[in-house]
């Protein structure tokens, strides 16, 4: 019979700067029923508040809905674990919603093999930003990353797409079935999970000159260039 061990708030995330959730790890088990409560105050205030919603985020969590979420304000929070033997407190955690955004994965991932007559064939990848993110307000800049690999390969090939919501990939193995995924991240914040994988079969006649690859104007902001395999790798890889 001991008091509970010290809990630890280990993660806070917001999908869109409008709501956020924090999660804690319980400390050692005192062998008794233990109640957890999260209390917080905003920087510059002394009034303490209790977590408004212990349900939405699942076990050992606190969810802050829209009415409890303020931008540009630091939240100072701690978790109290209590049983009949006593209480233990986590360290205080300072949270600014601006820096904890982790968006949902991008949506509507579409992948197509394009084989124009006048140019080299390429893989065309297109997606939409996650619904919860409102890009029109200018609050958000989302950056995207694509990964792909042949179905049976172990290593992923990763391409950084910047703010684009479409991307072309030229260097692929003909006849292979590829998995393609995309993820996004705000300028300050965390990468989303990868989107569900989309599969694409690369035709056997998908061939090109290995010495040089032609990247389209859209990829390089209007200037068409002939670049080497090594340059291509640097251009796309992040």
């Amino acid at each position: 019979q001991l008091p509970p061990g010290k809990p630890e708030i280990f993660k806070c995330r917001s999908p869109n700067k409008e709501t956020f959730t924090c999660w804690w790890r319980p400390g050692t088990d005192g062998g008794l029923p233990t109640n957890y409560s999260l209390t917080y105050h905003r920087e510059g205030e002394t009034l303490m508040h209790e977590c408004p919603d212990y349900i939405t985020g699942g076990p050992n969590s606190c969810h802050f809905g829209k009415q409890y979420t303020s931008m540009w304000r630091t939240y100072i929070m701690m978790v109290n674990a209590t049983n009949q033997m006593g209480s233990s407190f986590s360290d205080e955690l300072y949270v600014d919603v601006t820096y904890i955004v982790q968006p949902d994965p991008p949506l509507e991932l579409a992948v197509e093999v394009k084989q124009p007559e006048d140019r080299k064939p390429y893989l065309w990848i297109k997606w939409s930003p996650p619904t919860l993110i409102d890009l029109k307000t200018g609050w958000f800049t989302l950056l995207y990353e694509i990964r792909l690999k042949p179905e049976k390969a172990a290593e992923w090939e990763i391409h950084f797409a910047g703010q684009q919501t479409e991307f072309k990939i030229l260097s692929l193995h003909p006849g292979q079935k590829y998995l393609v995924q995309v993820r996004c991240k705000p300028d300050h914040g965390y990468w989303s999970a990868w989107s569900p994988a989309t599969f694409i079969q690369i035709p056997s006649d998908f061939t090109m000159n290995d010495e040089q690859k032609l990247i389209s104007e859209e990829d390089l902001g209007g200037e068409q260039k002939l670049i080497s395999e090594e340059d291509l790798h640097h251009h796309h890889h992040h």
Epitope: Q1, L2, P3, D29, G31, L32, P33, Q84, M85, G86, S88
Partner: antibody, heavy 117, light 107 residues
Framework: QVQLVQSGAEVKKPGASVKVSCKAS????????ITWVRQAPGQGLEWMGW????????DYAQKFQDRVTMTTDTSTTTGYMEMRSLTSDDTAVYYC??????????WGQGTLVTVSS | DIQMTQSPSSLSASVGDRVTITCRAS??????LAWFQQKPGKAPKSLIY???SLQSGVPSKFSGGGSGTDFALTISSLQPEDFATYYC?????????FGQGTRLEIK
């Protein structure tokens, strides 16, 4: 009201075993546990270990680890402490105690165990 | 293991006196400290928990203080029924340990 009632005094020979019971009443037994503390004649208090009625967890003092078993029976709201391989050094009053609202707020009356050849 | 050292080991005082018993832990115990009173042939009785909180039904002449590793029990005005042995106990971590006791006798 909360009560912990212990079994009666025991006289045992060296090498024997003893099992002391502690019947709890007046509170929700399943949200706590039973702790055992002993006191040799003229000596101080010594924590032996405890058994949780909440999740079955047990913790023993290292010196008793190999020869003590503590259990709780939620159906009868009773805690048990069994000690094996008794020696004369185990002659003591054995107390059970519990946590109802605050640490060790209720105690049994004690059970004298005498080990003598 | 956390060692608990009580002082003095015995103390003579008169009715009406104010007495203080101290207890030192060998490491920080996060204020998880209790005080018990024991009379001959009786079970211990809990007086104080969490270093300074009074157990239900315990008279306010008993008070606990201290933090970290150094703690004290004060009895503000001794009455005949207060002459007994007092133990401190840490319950911060296993094994739970007690001080060796302070015997409070009538002068």
């Amino acid at each position: 009201q909360v009560q912990l009632v212990q079994s009666g005094a025991e006289v045992k020979k060296p090498g024997a075993s003893v099992k002391v019971s502690c019947k709890a009443s007046g509170y929700t037994f399943g949200t706590s546990g039973i702790t055992w503390v002993r006191q040799a004649p003229g000596q101080g208090l010594e924590w032996m270990g405890w058994s949780s009625a909440y999740n079955g967890k047990t913790d023993y003092a290292q010196k008793f680890q190999d020869r003590v078993t503590m259990t709780t029976d939620t159906s009868t709201t009773t805690g048990y402490m069994e000690m094996r391989s008794l020696t004369s050094d185990d002659t003591a009053v054995y107390y059970c105690t519990t946590v109802v609202r605050r640490p060790f707020d209720f105690w049994g009356q004690g059970t004298l165990v005498t080990v003598s050849s | 293991d956390i060692q608990m050292t009580q002082s003095p080991s015995s103390l003579s005082a008169s009715v009406g006196d104010r007495v203080t018993i101290t207890c030192r832990a060998s490491q920080d115990i996060n204020n998880f400290l209790a005080w018990f009173q024991q009379k001959p042939g009786k079970a211990p009785k809990s007086l104080i928990y969490a270093a300074s909180s009074l157990q239900s039904g315990v008279p306010s002449k008993f008070s606990g203080g201290g933090s970290g590793t150094d703690f004290a029990l004060t009895i503000s005005s001794l009455q005949p029924e207060d002459f007994a042995t007092y133990y401190c106990q840490q319950y911060s971590s296993y094994p739970i340990t007690f001080g060796q006791g302070t015997r409070l006798e009538i002068k």
